[in-house]
Interface confidence: medium
């Protein structure tokens, strides 16, 4: 394991550094210039540094589990799981789920009562006694109810000519009831009777564009319990149709752009405001399946049968049967779902922060095995047989205490996981003994925490009324830069520099900004080698004899002395035995300067004052022009012919020295004035 | 600015052993290097051995085994054991240190002692 640390002072840091953190408690573990981090690491490397094993601080993530022996019929186990969890380490349980016999069921028909499914209907009146005794041979406690829809009673779902809204159907003579989006007819019961009653008053009623508003109204019996009666047990919506269905975005063609707000919207058993709102998205009415624990079965007939199946990829906990055209077989269809139902089991969580983290691994009763899943998945699961799940949760940081939920979806049953920080280092200190702390402070975890107005590794620094920040302000470079070069502890307001675990390698610097080894290398060797030189704040310091950045040169000027034996003829300087020429003066010697500009116009005050003792400079001369020398004799050198203050022509030569700005001159005795007109 | 104390030389025969100290004092922030040069008559200045800052020593091949150089931090002090002394030991040894200024940013400057006869006679 690593342990990866940034900046930790504290036990409680290392530990939520990651999982392969651990903290050393022992006294005086960490030397002058040590950090306090030192004390976090793994804990091969803290024993190997010399901490004890009962020293080091090493919280690991637990679960404690709870049975609850109250209340009726208990599928699940246990109820209530309570996990301490260290950031990074999961804390694992397992979940047993033993399916029950004879699990309450309530079931509600949904139908589609579009004019073609007519004969369908007529069917159905005579289904509830089918229906009920069907359920009584898998509970104990049945019960059935009824809804149905059509569609939103806009255009272009419904025809909106008023003769068309009384009677929606093709045939005129047919008696139709007028189209509607959502009809709540019963609320779940178990009198076969009233079933029979109510769904025989049924009038087929009927649209005109194919798909139908079926997932308005499955969100209506997700999003309205009371109304619906479901009781907390097996809840089942069969869904009946013969075509597709309106979802997000549909609502838009007739004009409805309020996106559906997943409430109970029942209004006299009427889904009344359907024209108000858009139809589910298909991942919301998920969701609120899931969320009610209700399990829907698609009864839809052949032509429709793969487009439910595609809807049950989506929704959890589904099943698809295909229904006979005029829905004879749909007792038989139901009983089938019901079996493929409920012989699968999801378990899975309710939404979770970003700071958790689920998983599932599976151990199926038919010996099959899923590992690492985001939920748990078992077929075939046999009535009595136990499946065990095991459940692995991690926390990313040191979490708030929370609870959360875990159910097998379409069962009542829940485990309440309660989730507590394991971030807590109970150290063995000598709490009260504050003579380690100067008595300014008291131990915790093997270093002080100094009491206000005092800071420190024993609290020896007293802040005399500047705030740690003032403090901490004279052990930064600048605002940008971090203490100490984050090198370094900063006591009080100065840097005291990490020593350093690399060999040869020291930092120091008033910010701990230096070390010794980070310098360019010669001849494979930090600066040469030690004998050549040193690194110090990454630049390398030459013993005398040695120059060069990485000291690689001996120091010797034979290269750069030009015939006079002048180092770079006095202008540039001898490095590495190559002349570095001050600017425009040219390799090798600096004699020549090209692209200089003319020294004439810059002299001839100084060709005056120098040989005919006259103009500005006439009076101070040699102060004026300390770099010239008067030569009696011509010289070689630039030539130059320049108006003096008297407007007369000098003509001089300049031979350039050595060294800057140094001539001798050499000035014609004659110099030409012309006569202003009289 | 530094200043650079030396003791220990001598007059000492062969097969003997001496040993020098140099002190350094003045606006020091921190002593990068101490050591000795040393320059036989009629030769170019060598050096000897230095000690680094982190207690890193180095010997010139000349000395290797012979000679021990060792520092006390706090007294700004170095010292130059010389054992199983030669002849050609003889020459007068300077004593070196390498020092940051205090106020001179981060540049180093290099301070020479006086210098310490050490004769060696056969």
């Known amino acids: 394991q690593e342990c990866t640390k940034f900046k930790v002072s504290s036990c409680r840091e290392c530990i939520e550094s990651g999982p392969g953190c651990t903290w050393c408690q022992k006294l005086n573990f960490t030397g002058p210039g040590d950090p306090d981090s030192i004390r976090c690491d793994t804990r091969p490397q803290l024993l190997m540094r010399g901490c004890a094993a009962d020293d080091i601080m090493d919280p690991t993530s637990l679960a404690e589990t709870q049975e609850d022996h109250n209340g009726g019929q208990k599928q699940l186990s246990p109820q209530k799981v309570t996990l301490y969890l260290r950031p990074g380490q999961a804390a694992a349980f397992n979940v047993t789920f033993r399916r029950a016999k004879g699990y309450p069921i309530d079931l509600y028909y949904l139908m589609d009562l579009s004019y073609s499914m007519l004969d369908d209907l007529r069917n159905v009146k005579k289904l509830g006694g089918d229906l009920l005794r069907a359920l009584n041979e898998i509970t104990e406690s049945g019960r059935i109810g009824f809804g149905s829809f059509v569609d939103k009673t806009v255009l272009p779902f419904v025809n909106t000519h008023p003769d068309k809204l009384r009677n929606p159907c093709p045939n005129k003579e047919k008696e139709c009831q007028p189209p509607f989006a959502f009809r709540h007819v019963l609320k779940l019961t178990n009198n076969s009777n009233q079933f029979q009653t109510e769904v025989g008053k049924q009038l087929i009623s009927g649209n005109l564009d194919a798909p139908e508003g079926g997932l308005d109204a499955m969100m209506q019996v997700a999003a309205c319990p009371e109304e619906i009666g479901w009781r907390n047990v097996t809840r089942l919506l069969v869904f009946a149709t013969d075509d597709g269905f309106h979802f997000a975005g549909d609502g838009k063609l007739g004009a409805i752009l309020t996106p559906n707000d997943g409430r109970c919207h029942l209004e006299d058993n009427l889904y009344k405001r359907s024209n108000e709102f858009d139809y589910p998205s298909v991942g919301q009415l998920a969701h609120k399946l899931a969320e009610n624990n209700i399990q829907p079965i698609f009864a839809v007939t052949s032509r429709m049968v793969k487009t439910y199946e595609k809807l049950t990829e989506i929704i959890p906990k589904s099943a698809v049967g295909e229904l006979s055209e005029d829905s004879s077989n749909v007792v038989h269809l139901i009983k089938n779902a019901y079996n493929k139902l409920s012989s699968r089991v999801f378990l899975d969580h309710n939404a979770l922060p970003d700071t958790l983290k689920v998983t599932y691994d599976s151990f199926c009763s038919n010996g099959v095995t899923h590992r690492n899943q985001p939920r748990g998945d078992c077929d075939g699961v046999q009535i009595n047989v136990p499946i065990t799940f095991q459940v692995k949760v991690t926390a990313t940081e040191c979490i708030q205490e929370q609870s959360f939920v875990i159910r097998a979806l379409g069962f009542t049953d829940i485990v309440t996981v309660q989730v507590l920080p394991q971030c807590e280092c109970r150290c063995r200190d000598q709490s009260r003994d504050r003579s380690l702390c100067h008595g300014k402070g008291f131990l915790e975890c093997g270093i002080c925490r100094c009491d206000t107005g005092y800071i420190g590794k024993n609290c020896e620094c007293q802040t005399q009324g500047r705030s740690s920040q003032e403090l901490e302000g004279s052990c930064r470079k600048d605002n940008n830069s971090i203490i100490c070069s984050g090198l370094g502890d900063c006591v009080c307001g100065q840097c005291l520099c990490h020593t350093s675990d690399v060999p040869g390698k020291l930092i120091y610097g008033q910010y701990c900004e230096c070390d010794t080894i980070n310098c360019e290398r010669y001849n494979g060797q930090v600066c040469g080698g030690p004998g050549r030189g040193l690194c110090f704040c990454g630049k390398c310091r030459c013993h005398p004899g040695f120059e060069g950045s990485a000291c690689q040169c001996e120091r010797t000027t034979e290269g750069c002395l030009n015939p006079r034996r002048v180092e770079c003829s006095g202008r540039g300087r001898c490095r590495c035995n190559v002349c570095e020429c001050h600017s425009g003066y040219q390799l090798p010697l600096c004699q020549e300067c090209p692209g200089c500009p003319s020294p004439c116009g810059k002299y001839i005050s100084c060709a005056e004052c120098l040989k005919f003792e006259k103009g500005p400079f006439g009076k101070n001369c040699s102060a004026a022009c300390p770099g010239l020398q008067l030569s009696n004799n011509p010289v070689k050198g630039r030539t130059c012919k320049e108006r003096d203050s008297e407007g007369c022509w000098v003509a001089y030569t300049l031979e350039q020295q050595d060294g800057m700005d140094r001539y001798l001159i050499y000035v014609d005795e004659s110099r030409e004035c012309v006569a202003g007109p009289n | 600015e530094v200043q650079l104390v030396e003791s220990g030389g001598g007059l000492v025969q062969t097969g003997g052993s001496l040993r020098l100290s140099c002190a350094a004092s003045?606006?020091?922030?921190?002593?990068?290097?101490m050591g000795w040069y040393r320059q036989a008559p009629g030769k170019q200045r060598e050096l000897v051995t230095t000690?680094?800052?982190?207690?890193?020593?180095y010997y010139s091949d000349s000395v290797k085994d012979r000679f021990t150089i060792s520092r006390d931090n706090a007294k700004n002090t170095a010292y130059l054991q010389m054992n199983s002394l030669k002849p050609e030991d003889t020459a007068v040894y300077y004593c070196?240190?390498?020092?940051?200024?205090?106020?001179?940013?981060?540049?180093?400057?290099?301070?020479f002692g006086q210098g310490t006869q050490v004769t060696v006679s056969s």
């Open positions: 070196y240190t390498k020092v940051i200024v205090m106020g001179a940013g981060m540049d180093d400057n290099d301070f």
């Open positions: 003045g606006s020091i922030f921190m002593i990068l290097a």
């Open positions: 000690i680094i800052r982190d207690g890193k020593t």
